[in-house]
Amino acid sequence: ACDTATCVTHRLAGLLSRSGGVVKNNFVPTNVGSKAF
């Protein structure tokens, strides 16, 4: 999987969208690793 900064951000945006935004506040692009996905 792509692990560039931009890929991580887009992937997280998709995850937040699917979860309705119900995730921890610190679940942000700069504070998650690729393992979070």
């Epitope: 560039t4 931009t6 890929c7 951000t9 887009h10 945006a13 942000v28 692009p29 700069t30």
Partner: antibody, heavy 119, light 107 residues
Amino acid sequence: EVQLVQSGAEVKKPGASVKVSCKASGYTFTDYYMNWVRQAPGQRLEWMGVINPYSGRTTYNRKFKGRVTITVDKSASTAYMELSSLRSEDTAVYYCASLLIRPHYFDYWGQGTTVTVSS
Amino acid sequence: DIQMTQSPSSLSASVGDRVTITCKASQNVGTNVAWYQQKPGKSPKALIYSASYRYSGVPSRFSGSGSGTDFTLTISSLQPEDVATYHCQQYNFYPYTFGQGTKLEIK
């Protein structure tokens, strides 16, 4: 309102260094990566590097061979790009850019900073 | 580094025309491609991410498609305000790389 406001135009001599700033507002600065991209006259956009403002970790374009340094001042929500050993080919418009999810899912760019390298 | 080759370099079309710009990557970049619109003297503005997804606020006449090495930006009905240079970018690998740009003019 999300804003990335860059420092003003610079004129430098060959061999000198330049440091461009990018002040972010309207979002949590440390939550999102900050990229630096430049555009020389008549040339394609060129990605220079990215920084994680939360950790300070950077990734650079190898093309710049150690001439570029990206840093942040978290307390001032400001990113910096320093380019050393300037040559005429470094004459370009330099942009900061950050892809956000909140408050809006969008790829925001600064207004650009013109750097002219001339003897 | 991944080479992004855009074509054409420039094109002239009439208001209402369907316009297609293509971008070819030198290696497989999945769908990790973005498209930007840049008007003279302005910063690039993001249009498309992940090859085919429009950012909020981008008019529906803009669409993107493709995967692997071949990508397309289509403007379904050209408007006068679409006069600009369009850039593709791959962000699958570091360093991110851009196409050389396509300058779009109105006939």
